[in-house]
């Protein structure tokens, strides 16, 4: 049979997902119901590996599968009739498959830094990069991330800095390729904690009796993490700035003369049965010298006529020595200290003085 050459196809339409493209086209020849169509699909930059699809007669659509996400392709469509008589020119169309979303990403806190490290494996296929969005309340930040390669299963990471401590952030990462955006991948991550900011003031110390004092102080600001505990520290020595080293000393050490500074009382804030908001500052009043015990610390009677200063340690993380039961491990804890109070001098023991006078 004799056939005239088919005219070229036109109006090529493409709809894509990550790994497939559905193509449809038109041919306006009267004889088009007798045509089949030959499709050549070529990945950009890879002409040696073209995929060929031939449709059944009269069919003007085709779905091509096993494509690579986020990649650019060109399709050429020839109309053909009889024994391979093809249209002079193919219809041509460039298209991109949709980029693949990131499967998931993990967050890691950075110890003692207001930052998060995000880690992910590259999604399959090609990408031009990623959009990163970080949001918490009214604050938000959008930034671009560089592209990655999925070929070797490498773990990629980025550090998100200039955040707040102990704060929950909504994080979203969107894959971009060929000007297309995948569905975003989301996670909620919370930043870590660090030493609390030291308070401006110092505790207030007042004499109650010849062997006890009252220490009043305000709760530390919780912007670096929730305050987990307070330690009340007494000294009879020079009131320099305390260090974490003093946390190991007890009333017993003081009595033995091993140290002129010791921890007399420990407050675990969880025991108060209430959560403390960032702006809420609690007031504390501690009776020092009442012979109570908190964990490994004995709140022993003070020396009459002694001169004492008080300081408060606040903890966002309190760690105890594994071998020294109930004693704080200062090096492993997140702690800061108030300044020492002014000194208070205790009165003499009136009863003892009276007894001495009669002898």
């Amino acid at each position: 049979a004799q056939y005239t050459r088919p005219s070229n196809v036109s109006n090529i339409d493409v709809s894509t997902n990550t790994t497939a493209a559905t193509l449809s086209w038109q041919n306006f020849d009267d004889a088009s119901p007798t045509y089949s169509y030959c499709l050549l699909i070529e990945k950009a930059g890879n002409s040696s590996n073209a995929t060929q699809v031939v449709t059944d007669i009269g069919i003007t659509d085709a779905t091509v599968t096993e494509l690579i996400p986020g990649s650019s392709y060109t399709v050429e469509i020839f109309a053909q009739v009889g024994d391979g008589i093809k249209s002079l020119e193919p219809g041509r169309k460039s298209f991109c498959t949709d980029p693949a979303s990131m499967a998931s990403f993990d967050c890691e806190v950075v110890p003692k830094e207001p930052a998060l490290v995000l880690k992910w494996t590259c999604p399959p296929g090609a990408n031009a990069g990623f959009e990163l969005e970080v949001s918490s309340g009214a604050w938000n930040n959008a930034t671009h991330l560089e592209s990655c390669s999925s070929e070797n299963g490498t773990e990629y990471r980025t550090e998100v800095t200039y955040l707040n401590f102990s704060t929950s952030y909504n994080i979203s990462i969107t894959t971009v390729s060929c000007g297309k955006m995948a569905a975003p991948t989301r996670n909620t991550c919370t930043t870590g904690i660090t030493d609390p900011p030291p308070p401006d003031g110092s505790p207030n110390i007042t004499s109650v009796s010849h062997n006890s004092v009252k220490v009043k102080f305000s709760g530390f600001e919780a912007s670096h993490g929730p305050i987990k505990a307070y330690a009340v520290i007494l000294t009879t020595g020079e009131a320099g700035h305390p260090s974490a080293d003093v946390l190991k000393y007890t009333y017993e050490d003081f009595k033995k003369g091993a140290s002129d500074t010791y921890v007399t009382y420990l407050i675990r804030t969880e025991e108060k049965g209430r959560s403390q908001s960032l702006s809420e500052v609690l007031k504390y009043e501690i009776d020092v010298g009442n012979e109570s015990t908190t964990l490994g610390y004995y709140n022993g009677k003070l020396e009459p006529l002694g001169s004492y200063r008080a300081c408060v340690a606040g903890f966002t993380n309190i760690t105890f020595h594994p071998q020294n039961k109930g004693l704080i491990d200062g090096a492993e804890s997140y702690v800061s200290f108030s300044r020492y109070s002014d000194a208070v001098s205790l009165p003499q023991d009136v009863a003892a003085a009276h007894h001495h006078h009669h002898h």
Partner: antibody, heavy 117, light 107 residues
Framework: EVKLVESGGGLVQPGGSLKLSCAAS????????MAWVRQAPTKGLEWVAY????????YYRDSVKGRFTISRDNAKSTLYLQMDSLRSEDTATYYC??????????WGQGTLVTVSS | DIQMTQTPHSLSASLGETVSIECLAS??????LAWYQQKPGKSPQLLIS???PLHDGVPSRFSGDGSGTQYSLKIRNMQPEDEGVYYC?????????FGAGTKLELK
């Protein structure tokens, strides 16, 4: 096929308000960062506002901050720009656009806003 | 704000000629540089994003190059349909900023 169609432009007096809309089709609107770009008559292009996909965070150029509000309705695949306290220097053709990785990829045909007394 | 200085302001080229448009950013923009073509009465069209990848359907006679602060758009084999105004734009930092444009005419 990606299609963006702006509407809502017109003539408004200084100090007045207008709300522009941009109807999107042919792509998954909710996945995309979107933006408004404007072009004053016979002038160059100027980015106006930008909105993210996940949390709808908005960013503005300084000259429109506090006067313009960008928003989106993913269910309707529509982007909006509420323009208040309009000034003569806001006179321009306003385009909506998709904006992955900081590039304005697909553009609408634009809608003309004229601020004049 | 990052300033984008585009040169030349205008140029005319003969059919088949190669033309180049330069764009200088006032600070490094990590290749977040796009090029657009705009014809009279039409919306701008993206040609190139991320300094060099061609957008879908853009003829291969267009190419982008550059890094850091200096970028260029090259058009080989000038065609009548290439007439128009060309803009560069940085998408690295808010506010996103455009060059002032280069008007390309056919000689």
């Amino acid at each position: 096929e990606v299609k963006l169609v702006e509407s809502g432009g017109g003539l408004v007096q200084p100090g007045g308000s207008l709300k522009l809309s941009c109807a999107a089709s042919g792509f998954t609107f909710s996945n995309y960062y979107m933006a408004w770009v404007r072009q004053a008559p016979t002038k160059g292009l100027e980015w106006v506002a930008y909105i993210t996909n996940s949390f709808g965070s908005a960013y503005y150029r300084d000259s429109v901050k506090g006067r313009f509000t960008i928003s989106r309705d993913n269910a309707k695949s529509t982007l909006y720009l509420q323009m208040d306290s309009l000034r003569s220097e806001d006179t321009a053709t306003y385009y909506c656009s998709t904006v992955p990785l900081g590039a304005f990829v697909y553009w609408g045909q634009g809608t003309l806003v004229t601020v004049s007394s | 704000d990052i300033q984008m200085t585009q040169t030349p302001h205008s140029l005319s080229a003969s059919l088949g000629e190669t033309v180049s448009i330069e764009c200088l950013a006032s600070e490094g923009i990590s290749n977040y540089l796009a090029w657009y073509q705009q014809k009279p009465g039409k919306s701008p069209q993206l040609l190139i994003s991320h300094a060099n990848p061609l957008h879908d359907g853009v003829p291969s006679r267009f190419s982008g190059d550059g890094s850091g602060t200096q970028y260029s758009l090259k058009i080989r084999n000038m065609q009548p349909e290439d007439e128009g105004v060309y803009y560069c734009q940085q998408g690295y930092k808010f506010p996103y900023t455009f060059g002032a444009g280069t008007k390309l005419e056919l000689k």
